[in-house]
């Protein structure tokens, strides 16, 4: 689950160890803070829920792209 | 604070190597990955390549595959870059960055490579 | 490689103009696309990176938009510290790639 640290940090300290179907991903933020212990991606679920994942893994990555093709495609 | 912190300045002669240094501090570069981009003077940035310290998995520029090698060694935190073959077109900035997605937000201060006979 | 051409390649600005710098990918590169700031002799600094992000610290006036192919980075009103040549990159696909940069001189 991502934590708050303050008013305007989000850091993610555990990441999800199994993968997400890419059907259940709404939308992602890129967590680069350098406040942070590492670097992380959130993906927003369908269903509301924030999930910390691992950026270097590559369901992750794939995961990204996807939803990047997708909301673009989806703009007037 | 996040800082990298790159080896000094080095004259080479054309056909020789070099390898550049580059030493985190607050940040633990197994988390990341660290990237190595050129600049040559008055041009713009050219990226050379990556490597995740974690797993030592590189990835490069197909340009530079096989003239450059990435290492790191996370107990001392830092990486690597030896580019061999030099030739006068190498002389540059040489800039070292970390950056799991792509973009890079954290730079070391640049090592100036001149390549002269 | 996706090539990325940015223009122009210089422009001369007043402090307090408005000023845009274009990007344009070779192909669909689906916002992935990061701006940067190099002054003389120093590393270049990381703007804006994705669709809107604007760096920690970057001051508001730095703003990007647009999206597929064609990107913009929009200076609101020119300050004496944003004299400098700026950088668009790629990072939809390795090897990521540089525009050519647009230097902002003084009028």
């Known amino acids: 689950q991502p934590d708050s640290v303050s008013i305007a940090i989000t850091c993610c300290f555990n990441v999800i160890n199994r993968k997400i179907p890419i059907q259940r991903l709404e939308s992602y933020t890129r967590i680069t803070n350098i406040q942070c212990p590492k670097e992380a991606v959130i993906f927003k679920t369908k269903r509301g829920k924030e999930v910390c994942a691992d950026p270097k893994e590559r369901w992750v990555r794939d995961s990204m792209k996807h939803l990047d093709q997708i909301f673009q495609n989806l703009k007037p | 604070q996040v800082q990298l912190v790159q080896s000094g300045a080095e004259v080479k002669k054309p056909g020789s190597s070099v390898k550049v240094s580059c030493k985190a501090s607050?940040?633990?570069?197994?988390?990341?990955?660290m990237h190595w981009v050129r600049q040559a003077p008055g041009q713009g940035l050219e990226w050379m390549g990556r490597?995740?310290?974690?797993?030592?998995?590189?990835k490069f520029d197909p340009k530079f595959q096989g003239r450059v090698t990435i290492t790191a060694d996370t107990s001392t935190s830092t990486a690597y870059m030896e580019l061999s073959s030099l030739r006068s077109e190498d002389t540059a900035v040489y800039y070292c960055?970390?950056?799991?997605?792509?973009?890079?937000?954290?730079w070391g201060q640049g090592t100036t490579v001149t390549v002269s006979s | 490689d996706i090539q990325m051409t940015q223009s122009p390649s210089s422009l001369s600005a007043s402090v307090g103009d408005r000023v845009t710098i274009t990007c344009k990918a070779f192909?669909?590169?689906?916002?992935?696309r990061a701006w940067y700031q190099q002054k003389p002799g120093k590393a270049p600094k990381l703007l804006i990176h994705?669709?809107?992000s604007l760096e920690h610290g970057v001051p508001s006036r730095f703003s990007g938009s647009g999206s597929g192919t064609d990107y913009t980075l929009t200076i609101s009103s020119l300050q004496p510290e944003d004299f400098a040549t700026y950088y668009c990159?790629?990072?939809?696909?390795?090897?990521?790639?540089f525009g050519g940069g647009t230097k902002v001189e003084i009028k």
């Open positions: 607050g940040l633990t570069i197994s988390h990341t990955y």
């Open positions: 990159q790629q990072f939809w696909s390795a090897p990521y790639t």
């Open positions: 994705g669709a809107t």
């Open positions: 960055a970390r950056g799991v997605f792509g973009f890079f937000d954290h």
């Open positions: 490597i995740d310290p974690d797993n030592h998995n590189t």
């Open positions: 192909e669909d590169i689906y916002n992935r």
